[in-house]
Interface confidence: low
Amino acid sequence: VPRWRQQWSGPGTTKRFPETVLARCVKYTEIHPEMRHVDCQSVWDAFKGAFISKHPCNITEEDYQPLMKLGTQTVPCNKILLWSRIKDLAHQFTQVQRDMFTLEDTLLGYLADDLTWCGEFNTSKINYQSCPDWRKDCSNNPVSVFWKTVSRRFAEAACDVVHVMLNGSRSKIFDKNSTFGSVEVHNLQPEKVQTLEAWVIHGGREDSRDLCQDPTIKELESIISKRNIQFSCKNIYRPDKFLQCVKNPEDSSCTSEI
């Protein structure tokens, strides 16, 4: 429900948001030669156009289409890593395993990662005071719609074996309400994706349970199987060792289960 004077329940737009987006874009296009044709000023203009002067509870995927077009990027479709509630480890992994990509390794994901933004209806102002919260205010807010849009496109692009990293320390290892559970799972294309392989990351050092048997993982398997995609699951008992072995696969201790 819109609040008087647009007082929303969530935090306001990230400080220096326009400068941050532009600077990230410049940095990304420098680091990724295949994206150096991207004009960052145009990217910012398209980003801004998606939410400025619009009611922050009435944003649509259509609003982001100009930005999606400018940020079109081809990543190897068989090298996609999805994640849910375990972003930091997923990013650490792709920093080491440079041929695999999370959404935040793409230009659009990189631009928006950890940022919040919203505008106000009929004014060109960015709202730095508060922005709509997904639960308490509305789901069609600028940030939620952005991530829904890019996540859908990212999942649609995937092929062959798709990996997903899941947090085994949470009560719901697979959460149907997460972006992975509500968007990405349903947008994997069965004609392109052969297998979804879940990596369940254990939190406790002494935790030797088979979390692939968790009821929520069985629920994920059921959803995936109904979509004619094969499912497999692996326990990552020691995430620290897992990363170390990705860095140094020749290490003798890396032959045992991690």
Partner: antibody, heavy 120, light 111 residues
Framework: EVQLVESGGGLVKPGGSLKLSCVAS????????MHWVRQAPEKGLEWIAF????????YYVDKVKGRFTISRDNAKNTLFLQMTSLRSEDTAMYYC?????????????WGQGTTLTVSS | DIVLTQSPASLAVSLGQRATVSCRAS??????????MHWYQQKPGQPPKLLIY???NLESGIPARFSGSGSRTDFTLTINPVETDDVATYYC?????????FGGGTKLELK
């Protein structure tokens, strides 16, 4: 006021080496990619090399690859071009140029240039 | 490499008249609907100065008598009306593909 001041040019024999410098002021040097561009006497402009803000990405035109090295020292606001195995065709005015903030490859500020002459 | 061919090589125009410089690329310099073609002015003894970026955008501080147009392979820089201060050599540059390349230049003189 944005300023780029090149130095280090001079007369060098073929096969010799030289290091050019470009000191930047009036802007946050570490926020901008930088380029070297040269211009042979009475000729057109030729892009030579680019270095990104944190030096993670470096590009050269083929004819100088392996002979020229672009580098930067963000703490000292300085851009460098180390040139080795110099040839007579490297004779030119060498300009450092600042990369336009919002798009790779074009230049909003240039230095006044420093002259390199390669001759025996 | 993308080759940029400028024409004419030199141009003599009367004060107050229109000057038109052409730049033709050996392949398209467009990407995602943006033309990665830029124009510079260079006066004798001075470094080049950015006039137009991305085919038609006037750089800050450049007089409105300068304009750019074109897409894909064919681009035009127009100066209208020409003033005494415009005597210089004009270069086009593409940034769509490495290596970055410049045209050979067009020298503008007054009649």
């Amino acid at each position: 006021e944005v300023q780029l001041v090149e130095s280090g040019g001079g007369l060098v024999k073929p096969g010799g080496s030289l290091k050019l410098s470009c000191v930047a002021s009036g802007f946050t040097f570490s926020d901008y990619g930088m380029h070297w561009v040269r211009q042979a006497p009475e000729k057109g402009l030729e892009w030579i090399a680019f270095i990104s803000t944190g030096s993670s990405n470096i590009y050269y035109v083929d004819k100088v690859k392996g002979r020229f090295t672009i580098s930067r020292d963000n703490a000292k606001n300085t851009l460098f071009l180390q040139m080795t195995s110099l040839r007579s065709e490297d004779t030119a005015m060498y300009y450092c140029a600042r990369n336009y903030v919002s798009s790779y490859g074009y230049f909003d500020y240039w230095g006044q240039g420093t002259t390199l002459t390669v001759s025996s | 490499d993308i080759v940029l061919t400028q024409s004419p090589a030199s141009l003599a125009v009367s004060l107050g008249q229109r000057a038109t410089v052409s730049c033709r690329a050996s392949e398209s310099v467009d990407n995602y609907g943006i033309s990665f073609m830029h124009w510079y002015q260079q006066k004798p003894g001075q470094p080049p100065k950015l006039l137009i970026y991305r085919a038609s955008n006037l750089e800050s501080g450049i007089p409105a008598r300068f304009s750019g147009s074109g897409s894909r392979t064919d681009f035009t820089l127009t100066i209208n009306p020409v003033e005494t201060d415009d005597v210089a050599t004009y270069y086009c540059q593409q940034t769509n593909k490495d290596p970055l390349t410049f045209g050979g230049g067009t020298k503008l003189e007054l009649k």
